[in-house]
């Protein structure tokens, strides 16, 4: 049994880091493998993550963490029984993938303005809470070419757009994702999408 693709890990900078790797053949990850992880810190203990299958030869492990600070570094040991398959380390602050925003809501009752709001996925005491910026994706269900991205570079989890910038009388969907420049993170996953029917009053033409 050998590791074909070494584990790569990302942290949500809160409570979970996710490590993925590939074996050289079909593997029952949960019964055959264990990923041991230990914070490099005085008197810390090793903890065990039981991996799950992620495709035939792929494995994924969700490492529970109490919290994360920038100085943290973990040792990782991948075991198959008594055999050490791979040894590495992981610094969560250098491999951050933020949590996806939630509760995306489209408010259509504000005159001819669409107000999109969502929730910051972090609690106020987490460092990322005040460092997230967002991308909002809006697309038409009827027209695949009608697809747009709005970059929200301010901290407030909301976006206002004129309803007239979208076509009237058709359905649109929106989703949002987050990233944090301070840790040069990757983008989060997209939030679940939300749907609304776009309708607004056309202004009377002046002759």
């Amino acid at each position: 049994m050998k590791v074909l693709q070494e584990p790569t890990c990302v942290s949500d900078y809160m409570s979970i880091s996710t490590c993925e790797w590939k074996m050289n053949g079909p593997t029952n990850c949960s019964t055959e493998l264990r990923l041991l992880y230990q914070l490099v810190f005085l008197l810390s203990e090793a903890h065990t993550c039981i991996p799950e299958n992620n495709g035939g030869a792929g494995c994924v492990c969700h490492l529970l963490m109490d919290d994360v600070v920038s100085a943290d570094n973990y040792t990782l040991d991948l075991w198959a029984g008594q055999q050490l398959l791979w040894k590495g380390s992981f610094k969560p602050s250098e491999h951050v993938k933020p949590r996806a925003p939630g509760n995306l809501t489209v408010h259509t009752n504000v005159s001819d303005t669409l107000l999109l709001t969502w929730s910051n996925p972090y609690p106020p005491d987490n460092y990322l809470y005040n460092h997230l910026t967002y991308a909002v994706n809006i697309w038409s269900e009827n027209d695949p070419a009608d697809f747009r991205i709005y970059n929200v570079t301010y901290l407030e989890p909301s976006l206002r757009i004129a309803a007239s910038t979208l076509k009237s009388g058709i359905s649109y969907r929106a989703r949002v994702r987050a990233w944090a420049q301070c840790y040069n993170t990757t983008w989060s996953e997209w939030s679940p999408s939300t749907k609304w029917h776009n309708s607004y009053r056309e202004p009377f033409e002046q002759h």
Partner: antibody
């Protein structure tokens, strides 16, 4: 009441051995790292050794490395310090102390918040 | 090893007056925001040491509020706002960030 009680001290000749014990009560012993600190007559405090809650990780001062062994029996709520190849400079009062919560992913530290009464070790010919 | 240097080594104080002890470490003891791994202990004559302050500024359970700890990185201070007769003894700072734990030399506080 949270309590630590040391025993096992005494007079021993240079080159001899002693085993100190520290019995814990009033707290969940296995969840805490434990530490030994000593104090030579008229001197300050000197850290000797520490052990994690599971016993899987141990640390020693250079002055005792290779001669002293720290261990624990969580079923008996007891910490030990096996002292071999004793030297005159090991003469001191030995204290055990309750250290950080070490079973969490990140050890939780609240200082060495409980100390035993101390046991005296005298090494002399 | 991290060296902990205390000053003064002797501190005569009049009851009711404030007192201050300094401790300097040879390396930073700051691990993360607000977490400095330095403690303060008091050892009264013939007794075991007792914890006063942990993580630089957290008062241990049962410690009177006249004791306070401050500082970050390499420079730390223990302050007693109004010294009482029962405060006499040796005060030690200790770092617990890395092995080996190291103590300061001790400061002897005595009543004038």
């Amino acid at each position: 009441e949270v309590q630590l009680v040391e025993s096992g001290g005494g007079l021993e000749q240079p080159g001899g051995s002693l085993r100190l014990s520290c019995a814990g009560s009033g707290f969940t012993f296995r969840t805490y790292a434990m530490t030994w600190v000593r104090q030579a007559p008229g001197k300050g405090l000197e850290w000797v050794s520490s052990i994690s809650g599971s016993g899987g990780n141990t640390y020693y001062a250079d002055s005792v490395k290779g001669r002293f062994t720290i261990s624990r029996d969580n079923s008996k709520n007891t910490l030990y310090l096996q002292m071999n190849s004793l030297r005159a400079e090991d003469t001191a009062v030995y204290y055990c102390a309750k250290d950080r919560v070490s079973i969490t992913i990140r050890p939780r530290y609240y200082g060495l918040d409980v100390w035993g009464q101390g046991t005296t070790v005298t090494v002399s010919s | 090893d991290i060296v902990m240097t205390q000053s003064p080594l002797s501190l005569p104080v009049t009851p009711g007056e404030p007192a201050s002890i300094s401790c300097t470490s040879s390396q930073s003891l700051l691990y993360s925001i607000g977490k400095n791994y330095v403690d303060w202990y008091l050892q009264k004559s013939g007794q075991s040491p007792q914890l006063l302050i942990y993580e630089g500024n957290n008062r241990a359970t049962g410690v009177p509020d006249r004791f306070s700890g401050s500082g970050s990185g390499t420079d730390f201070t223990l302050k007693i706002s109004r010294v009482e007769a029962e405060d006499v003894g040796f005060y030690y700072c200790m770092q617990s960030l890395t092995s080996p734990y190291t103590f300061g030399q001790g400061t002897k506080l005595e009543i004038k």
